[in-house]
């Protein structure tokens, strides 16, 4: 599973479970970690570990928890007012452009460039030239002369909504 | 591909109110996360509220919690943001961010696919 919410993941809460607490909505809002009911009478708190509400809203639900891939690891897991963050493994990285999955970083630089920048779980290896010192945009290295990286660093959230 | 355009706004007094608008062309936008951030002169782009989608609920920072209503016409792939008891501090560019997906509303820059080129409000007596 990935990071996004269809509308089937919202399913509705049972509303009347004796351990949802209930609060009162300010200026027709519910606090974080909350939802409005639907008479919009009450907050209901998200259930811990399950669903979460990050901003004052009228969500009728609250959004539920994201679980990390096979291939991620769970750097904090999900409370009532913040979502799973999850990262990816060491040696994969995750684009902004492809949020979907973890891709492998490159082993090494194609021939005539050299590495300034490691694998890191939101980066691929960084390459440039050796005599300009532009960036190299190629996706599959050279085999022969590779340069080869270290393993990724810690540690930056992968979850995309913050 | 997604093009925002925004729209309504201005210079206003303290207290005032504006509506301000997003209109969105290229595809539509029915089944994505839509929002606004601002950037205030100096300071860095902020979340300001925003919807998961059509009828499904909505997000609000806490500093324009209840001054300012998010909305939404899918129909006519526009999102609006009426802002009401304007103050000093709520001056800034206003930038339309939509998210490819329903995912859960785009509070944070990254979670944004596409960025209007943004409306200024000025508050000031």
């Known amino acids: 599973e990935s990071a996004l919410i269809t509308q089937q993941d919202l399913a509705p809460q049972q509303r009347a479970a004796p351990q949802q607490k209930r609060s009162s909505p300010s200026e027709g809002l519910c606090p974080p970690g909350h939802h409005i009911s639907e008479d919009g009478r009450d907050c209901i708190s998200c259930k811990y570990g399950q669903d979460y509400s990050t901003h004052w809203n009228d969500l009728l639900f609250c959004l539920r928890c994201t679980r990390c891939d096979s291939g991620e690891v769970e750097l904090s897991p999900c409370t009532t007012t913040r979502n799973t963050v999850c990262q990816c493994e060491e040696g994969t990285f995750r684009e902004e452009d492809s949020p979907e999955m973890c891709r492998k970083c490159r082993t090494g630089c194609p021939r005539g460039m050299v590495k300034v920048g490691d694998c890191t779980p939101w980066s691929d290896i960084e390459c440039v030239h050796k005599e300009s010192g532009t960036k190299h945009s190629g996706e599959v290295p050279a085999v022969e002369e590779t340069v080869t990286s270290s393993p990724g660093t810690p540690a930056s959230p992968c979850s995309l909504s913050g | 591909e997604v093009q925002l355009l925004e729209s309504g706004g201005g210079e206003v007094q303290p207290g005032g109110s504006l509506r301000l608008s997003c209109a969105a062309s290229g595809r539509s936008i029915s089944n994505y996360a839509m929002g606004w951030f601002r950037q205030a002169p100096g300071k860095e782009r902020e979340f300001v509220s925003a919807?998961?989608?059509?009828?499904?609920?909505?997000y609000y920072a806490e500093s324009v919690k209840g001054r300012f209503t998010i909305s939404r016409d899918d129909a006519k792939s526009t999102l609006y943001l009426q802002m009401s008891s304007l103050r000093a501090e709520d001056t800034a560019v206003y930038y339309c961010?939509?998210?490819?997906?329903?995912?859960?509303?785009?509070?944070?820059?990254?979670?944004?696919?596409?960025w209007g080129q943004g409306t200024l409000v000025t508050v000031k007596p």
């Open positions: 919807s998961v989608w059509n009828n499904g609920g909505n």
């Open positions: 961010v939509v998210a490819r997906t329903p995912e859960t509303p785009i509070t944070s820059a990254r979670g944004a696919n596409y």
